[in-house]
């Protein structure tokens, strides 16, 4: 025959422990029911009652199956920052966290007491590391070859600009801009053409060389690209 | 010394697709652009695409885009080369090479690849 | 169009110089080009950087008697003494950005004999 389910409150068996979703209310010595999340006990049990609970008011929450007599308080409401990724409803606290653009320099059991905003990297600087929920982006100067003309906190050096003829030689803040031959151009062959915004090709060159193999100054125009001033973080 | 590994030969059958790869060593991967050619008898050499490991910029030889696609794994300094949808034409013998640096001209290629012979065959 | 126009082949006495042309677009008469040799069964290997002005820069290993020069859209590889192991393919290539558009072309080749 199968066991009789014992129905809450009951005295436990020596040595063994309450069942899931129940406590063993030291003053009645009996196991008794918990709370379920949204709820907080009302009226503890005793030796011919069970546990009485009731739903949390607002602005409070409980979370787990408890036998607490009160709910916790919501934390306060986000900061100007922050956007509220999770509401405040009975069954769980408001989580705040870092709006796009900011990372959380102090951070709580939930979400995020402190946002910063991310460091934008400046022309001639790309980032090294980006930026995450709790950590600020990394700048790193742009090496020889490879450019950023934005003030970006997402904006990597990119490589020049493939030219063959080179109107005006790349920098680290600068594209290449190459000279146009093409006949179906409205200006005349020879002429400069500016480059499109940068987002609009997906093409670009000239890689970092080595520095036991830095390129030959036979390479270079007089106007070659200068490298980025040592130390500078780019924030 | 700078050395390109290329991946070994390749018997496909028509519609399916093939991923090569090329193991760069002896210089810093991410500063060189690496360069995808396709070379069939009598067709000499064919120009599909590159890649800048460092930020993942990509050209595409326009007669090459939307059946190859070129990625790169920083991590083990190796570059990729996928290509779908496969038939007889695309069997060839496919070379990576190491863009040569240079600060103002279009540079060419120094280091190749000991080359991949893909075969599409039913 | 961006275009290496190459002859198909060319045959030569042992210790002669040879002189290979590559001419391009005429529009594209002052680019910059390389030049790749090819062995049979053998991957390219890069010879030489030619610009417009004659200028050169060759390639590691590549010996003393490969030189090159240039006349308006033609570029020229010159090899001077030539030797059995110069028997190859001789590729050019070009690149260039147009109308934001990278492109890598390579001529046809001239296929070298030394006789």
């Known amino acids: 025959l199968p066991a009789q389910v014992a129905f809450t409150p009951y005295a436990p068996e020596p040595g063994s422990t309450c069942r899931l979703r129940e406590y063993y209310d030291q003053t009645a010595q009996m196991c008794c029911s918990k709370c379920s999340p949204g709820q907080h006990a009302k009226v503890f049990c005793t030796k011919t009652s069970d546990t009485v609970c009731d739903s949390c008011e607002d602005s409070t929450y409980t979370q787990l199956w408890n036998w607490v007599p009160e709910c916790l308080s919501c934390g306060s409401r986000c900061s100007s920052d922050q956007v509220e990724t999770q509401a405040c409803t009975r069954e769980q606290n408001r989580i705040c966290t870092c709006r796009p653009g900011w990372y959380c320099a102090l951070s709580k059991q939930e979400g995020c007491r402190l946002c910063a905003p991310l460091r934008k990297c400046r022309p001639g600087f790309g980032v090294a590391r980006p930026g995450t929920e709790t950590s600020d982006v990394v700048c790193k100067p742009c090496a020889p070859g490879t450019f950023s003309n934005t003030t970006s906190s997402t904006d990597i050096c990119r490589p020049h600009q493939i030219c063959n003829v080179v109107a005006i030689p790349g920098n680290a803040s600068m594209d290449a801009v190459c000279t146009s031959t093409s006949p179906t151009r409205s200006m005349a062959p020879g002429a400069v053409h500016l480059p499109q915004p940068v987002s609009t090709r997906s093409q670009h060159t000239q890689p970092t060389p080595e520095p036991s193999t830095a390129p030959s100054t036979s390479f270079l125009l007089p106007m070659g690209p200068s490298p980025p001033a040592e130390g500078s973080t780019g924030d | 010394q700078v050395q390109l590994q290329q991946s070994g030969a390749e018997l496909v059958r028509p519609g399916t697709s093939v991923k090569m790869s090329c193991k760069a060593s002896?210089?810093?991967?991410?500063?060189?652009?690496i360069g995808w050619t396709k070379q069939r008898p009598g067709h000499g050499l064919e120009w599909i695409g590159d890649?800048?490991?460092?930020?993942?910029?990509?050209n595409y030889n326009e007669k090459f885009k939307g059946k190859a696609t070129l990625t790169a794994d920083k991590s083990s300094s190796t570059a990729y080369l996928q290509f779908s949808s496969l038939t007889s034409e695309d069997s060839a013998i496919y070379y990576c090479?190491?863009?040569?640096?240079?600060?103002?001209?279009?540079?060419?290629?120094?280091?190749w690849g000991q080359g991949t012979t893909l075969t599409v065959s039913s | 169009q961006l275009v290496l126009t190459q002859s198909s082949s060319a045959s030569f006495s042992l210790g002669a110089s040879a002189k290979l042309t590559c001419t391009l677009s005429s529009q594209h008469s002052m680019y910059t080009i390389e030049w790749y040799q090819q062995q049979p069964l053998k991957p390219p290997k890069f010879v030489m950087e030619l610009k417009k002005d004659g200028s050169h820069s060759t390639g590691d290993g590549i010996p003393d008697r490969f030189s090159g020069s240039s006349s308006g859209a033609d570029r020229y590889l010159n090899i001077s003494n030539i030797q059995p192991e110069d028997e190859a393919i001789y590729i050019c290539g070009v690149g260039d950005t147009i109308k934001e558009q990278f492109v890598y072309v390579f001529g046809g080749g001239t296929e070298v004999t030394v006789l």
């Open positions: 890649i800048f490991p460092g930020g993942d910029f990509t």
């Open positions: 002896g210089y810093t991967f991410t500063n060189y652009w």
């Open positions: 090479s190491r863009r040569r640096f240079t600060t103002i001209v279009a540079p060419g290629f120094d280091y």
